[in-house]
C-alpha cells in the first residue's frame, strides 16, 4: 500500500492552512513533506543562477516551459526556459505566459473572443511511476475553452494553474489535480528534493506568495536535514 | 451529462486476456485521476486499480498486480484495463470511478468479466 | 490497508421507522485539507452501487433528505429517517483517503 505517501497522518501535524499549498517563488508546486517529488532548488539568487533540468513543463514555474536550450539541440538535454510573451513564436501552448495560448505558432491572448471551441494540446512525456510497470508514450490532451473563460475556485480540478483564479495555482490532489491557495507568509512550505530523489508525489502544494520565498525557519536550524521546517518567508 | 460507460466485458478461458474500456463525458477527464473497481458476484466492493490524471502513476491492488495494467488516452476521454492471465476469481462486474477529489460522481453500469473453462 | 468494519451486517425494518448503520475505519479519514473522505453507497438488487452520502455528510444529489451521514475521525453513521420500501439493498461505506479504496463489508437492509 501507499501508507506512507496516501496517509492523511502524512502532512497532519503541520501547522494550518494545510489545504492549501506550499513551495517556493515561481514554481509551480512542491510535494508535501515526507512525500518525495523528484525536484530541485532552482530558484536562487540571481547571481547564483544555474538552469534547471526539466524533463517536462509541469517541473517548471509557471512563467516558464522545459525545452531544448539551443534550436535542433541535444533532445536529452532540457531546461526550463522563460514563458514567451504574447505575439512571440511559439510551437504549444506551454511555451507561452499565462494567460496565453499558442495560435498558429503564436503565442495570443486566451481572453480574445476568437478563443472558442477547443485546443488540441500535443505534449509528448516520458513517465515513471508505475509501482508495477514502466512506460512512456504520448498523449494528446483536449482542453476545453470554457477552462479559460470561467477561472476555477479552490477546490475545483483544472490542468494548469492559469485554470485557476488569483491566489489558487493548479496542483495535484491524490491523483488529480485541483486548486490550491498559493501561501501567506508564515505557511509551510516545501523545498523541491535534488533531481534523482524520486518518490510519488500525491498531495503538492502551490509556491509561497509574491515577495516570499520558502526558507527554513530560524528556529529549525537546528534540526536533522531531513526535518527542517521551512515557511514562506519576505525576502 | 456526466456520465462513465464501461465495456469489453465478456466470457474469456483462464490464462487468457481480455481488455476493458471505460468512456468519459461531460467532465474534464484529463484532470483527474481514474480508478477501477469491481465486484464478484455475490460479493462485496473491492477496488483494483488507480491512474493519475496524466497517466504517469499508476497503483495496483496486490491481487492483480503484475496481471492488470491501467492506462488512459486523454485525447480520447478513455480509461482502459488490459486484464492478462485471468483467474476464476478475476469474474466479475468491473466498475470506473472518478477520483473523489471534488464533486463526487456515480459510477457507469460496470461491464461483466466471466472467467470460466 | 485500512479496514471499513460495518455494523450490523443485516437489518429488518419496518417502513417508515428509522434505520442506523455504523461503520468504523481503522485508521483516520480526515484530510489535512480538512475533508473526510467517507462514502456511503446503496446498491439495490440488480443494480450497480449508486452514491448516497460524499465526504460524510453530503446528499448527492438526487438523494431523498431521509438519509443523512454523520461521525468524523474514525466513527461514522448513516442514518434513514423513515425507511421506504425502495431503500432495500446492500449499503456499503469506502474511504477514498488512501489507495487501495476499501469498502466496508455492507449492510443488507429488508423490509419486515
Known amino acids: 500500500t501507499l501508507n506512507s505517501v496516501l496517509n492523511s497522518n502524512a502532512i497532519k501535524n503541520l501547522p494550518p492552512p494545510l489545504g492549501g499549498a506550499a513551495g517556493h517563488p515561481g514554481s509551480a508546486v512542491s510535494a508535501a513533506p515526507g512525500i518525495l517529488y523528484p525536484g530541485g532548488n532552482k530558484y536562487q539568487t540571481i547571481d547564483n543562477y544555474q538552469p534547471y533540468p526539466c524533463a517536462e513543463d509541469e517541473e517548471c514555474g509557471t512563467d516558464e516551459y522545459c525545452a531544448s536550450p539551443t534550436r535542433g539541440g541535444d533532445a536529452g538535454v532540457q531546461i526550463c526556459l522563460a514563458c514567451r510573451k504574447r505575439r512571440k513564436r511559439c510551437m504549444r501552448h506551454a511555451m507561452c505566459c499565462p494567460g496565453n495560448y499558442c495560435k498558429n505558432g503564436i503565442c495570443v491572448s486566451s481572453d480574445q473572443n476568437n478563443f472558442r471551441g477547443e485546443i488540441e494540446e500535443t505534449i509528448t512525456e516520458s513517465f515513471g511511476n508505475d509501482h508495477s510497470t514502466l512506460d512512456g508514450y504520448s498523449r494528446r490532451t483536449t482542453l476545453s475553452s470554457k477552462m479559460y473563460h470561467s477561472k476555477g475556485q479552490e477546490g475545483s480540478v483544472c490542468l494548469r494553474s492559469s485554470d485557476c483564479a488569483t491566489g489558487l495555482c493548479c496542483a495535484r490532489h491524490f491523483w488529480s489535480k485541483i486548486c490550491k491557495p498559493v501561501l501567506k507568509e508564515g505557511q509551510v512550505c516545501t523545498k523541491h528534493r535534488r533531481k534523482g530523489s524520486h518518490g510519488l508525489e500525491i498531495f503538492q502544494r502551490c509556491y509561497c506568495g509574491e515577495g516570499l520565498s520558502c526558507r527554513i525557519q530560524k528556529d529549525h536550524h537546528q534540526a536533522s536535514n531531513s526535518s527542517r521546517l521551512h515557511t514562506c518567508q519576505r525576502h | 451529462q456526466v456520465q462513465l460507460v464501461e465495456s469489453g466485458g465478456g466470457v474469456v478461458q483462464p490464462g487468457r486476456s481480455l481488455r476493458l474500456s471505460c468512456a468519459a463525458s461531460?467532465?474534464?477527464?484529463?484532470?483527474?485521476?481514474m480508478h477501477w473497481v469491481r465486484q464478484a458476484p455475490g460479493k462485496g466492493l473491492g477496488w483494483v486499480a488507480v491512474?493519475?490524471?496524466?497517466?504517469?502513476?499508476?497503483y495496483y491492488a496486490d491481487s492483480v498486480k503484475g496481471r492488470f495494467t491501467i492506462s488512459r488516452d486523454n485525447s480520447k476521454n478513455t480509461l482502459y484495463l488490459q486484464m492478462n492471465s485471468l483467474r476464476a476469481e478475476d469474474t466479475a462486474v468491473y466498475y470506473c470511478?472518478?477520483?473523489?477529489?471534488?464533486?463526487?460522481?456515480?459510477w457507469g453500469q460496470g461491464t461483466t468479466v466471466t472467467v470460466s473453462s | 490497508d485500512i479496514v471499513m468494519t460495518q455494523s450490523p451486517l443485516s437489518l429488518s425494518v419496518t417502513p417508515g421507522q428509522p434505520a442506523s448503520i455504523s461503520c468504523k475505519s481503522s485508521?483516520?479519514?480526515?484530510?489535512?485539507?480538512?475533508?473526510?473522505?467517507l462514502y456511503w453507497y446503496l446498491q439495490k438488487p440488480g443494480q450497480p452501487p449508486q452514491l448516497l452520502i460524499y465526504?460524510?455528510?453530503n446528499r448527492f444529489s438526487g438523494v431523498p433528505d431521509r438519509f443523512s451521514g454523520s461521525g468524523s475521525g474514525t466513527d461514522f453513521t448513516l442514518k434513514i429517517s423513515r425507511v421506504e420500501a425502495e431503500d432495500v439493498g446492500v449499503y456499503y461505506c469506502m474511504q477514498s483517503i488512501q489507495v487501495p479504496w476499501t469498502f466496508g463489508q455492507g449492510t443488507k437492509v429488508e423490509i419486515k
Open positions: 491512474i493519475s490524471y496524466d497517466g504517469s502513476d499508476k
Open positions: 465526504e460524510v455528510s
Open positions: 470511478a472518478r477520483d473523489l477529489v471534488d464533486t463526487a460522481m456515480p
Open positions: 485508521q483516520s479519514l480526515l484530510h489535512s485539507d480538512g475533508k473526510t473522505y
Open positions: 461531460g467532465f474534464t477527464f484529463s484532470s483527474y485521476g
